[in-house]
């Protein structure tokens, strides 16, 4: 049968390349079963996730799934960094794996460069 | 059923290009990474890179890079090798693999297309 | 890159025996989770590989309990407690905390 646990479906080592100034979501898909967890995202600094108080953040709820939405309005080269989201379900902390934010700066870059020249080409990214 | 098929493989001369597929089915390929590894005659195994089918993000050994494209089509469970200038040294059995990107929960892989480089 | 190496690189063993393997990688195979991405694969002579043990230690689904995996930050082990006749093949540590992702040379466990 189907586990009732909170599960937060985010890849490991899973990444996402985009501009500065553009709007962006980033996106903890969580399957609950009866009642929905409280979620939070935080962003790393070193071995420490640091808790994003005070952000736009939105449910949205597809069929088997719903998505915990932080929202980035533009986004900031300053945004650059690992994320991760937390279920707070049963008093327990159910944590995902990070999921990295390559920002470039299109003021620095002549042309937009692809995803994977992003993620493969650290000196166009802010740390 | 759980079936990764590779296909496209056989004879082809150096410097020319080949696409080898990767048909899956029994799982949502979009939960998965597609990793591709290849195992020359006698030797180990080596992995050519991975592809995210969800959005398209690719990694790669770096000595494929450039030469070496990864893709997949998400809505038809399919993932694609492209290998271009090959050389005698890429001879191998070619597998392309899925592993569950969330908790790791199976590594399923293909059962290989041979490679031949030569004139 | 990091680089794993496998001992021994083949091994003569009986039916009944234990046997161990080891994989030592060059640095820590520890990702920012607390975990280590260490794989072990089989693979029997003309065939694919086949994902025995994932995570160091979980055994994959429908792999027999006689195998299990140890080990922590650079050093891992597979041990076979009682080998069966099945179990004669070229085995291979491989990690996916680090890219590229990087494989033992492999051993290959033969009949005595």
């Known amino acids: 049968k189907e586990s009732c646990d909170v599960q937060l479906y985010i890849k490991r080592q899973s990444y996402h390349s985009i501009f500065a100034g553009d709007p962006f979501k980033l996106e903890c898909p969580v399957k609950y079963c009866a009642h929905r967890p409280q979620v939070t995202w935080c962003k790393l600094n070193g071995t420490t996730c640091v808790k994003l108080e005070g952000r736009h953040t939105s449910w949205k709820q597809e069929k088997n799934l719903s998505f915990f939405i932080l929202h980035f309005e533009p986004v900031l080269p300053s945004d650059n960094g690992s994320y991760r989201c937390s279920a707070n379900f049963l008093s327990a902390i159910i944590e995902s794996h990070s999921t990295t934010l390559y920002v470039t700066d299109v003021k620095s870059a002549s042309e937009r460069p692809s995803k994977d020249e992003m993620a493969s080409r650290p000196w166009l990214l802010y740390s | 059923e759980v079936q990764l098929v590779e296909s496209g493989g056989g004879l082809v001369q150096p410097g020319r290009s080949l696409r080898l597929s990767c048909t899956t089915s029994?799982?949502?390929?979009?939960?998965?990474?597609i990793h591709w590894f290849r195992q020359a005659p006698g030797k180990g195994l080596e992995w050519v890179g991975r592809?995210?089918?969800?959005?398209?993000?690719?990694k790669y050994t770096a000595s494929f890079k450039g030469r070496a494209t990864i893709s997949a089509d998400g809505s038809k469970s399919i993932a694609y090798l492209q290998m271009n200038s090959l050389k005698t040294e890429d001879t191998a059995v070619y597998y392309c693999?899925?592993?569950?990107?969330?908790?790791?929960?199976?590594?399923?892989w293909g059962q290989g297309t041979l490679v031949t480089v030569s004139s | 890159d990091i680089q794993m190496t496998q001992s021994p690189s083949s091994l003569s063993a009986s039916v009944g025996d234990r046997v161990t393997i080891t994989c030592r990688s060059s640095q820590s195979l520890l990702d920012r989770d607390g975990k280590s991405y260490l794989n072990w694969l089989q693979q029997k002579p003309g065939k694919a590989p086949k994902r025995l043990i994932y995570l160091v230690s979980k055994l994959d689904s429908g792999v027999p309990s006689r195998f299990s995996g140890s080990g922590s930050g650079t050093d891992f082990t597979l041990t076979i407690s009682s080998l069966q006749p099945e179990d004669f093949a070229t085995y291979y540590c491989?990690?996916?905390?680090?890219?590229?992702?990087?494989f033992g040379q492999g051993t290959k466990l033969e009949i005595k």
């Open positions: 491989w990690q996916d905390t680090h890219f590229p992702y990087t």
């Open positions: 029994g799982f949502n390929i979009k939960d998965t990474y």
């Open positions: 693999a899925s592993y569950e990107g969330y908790y790791e929960r199976f590594g399923y």
């Open positions: 592809n995210d089918p969800a959005n398209g993000n690719t």
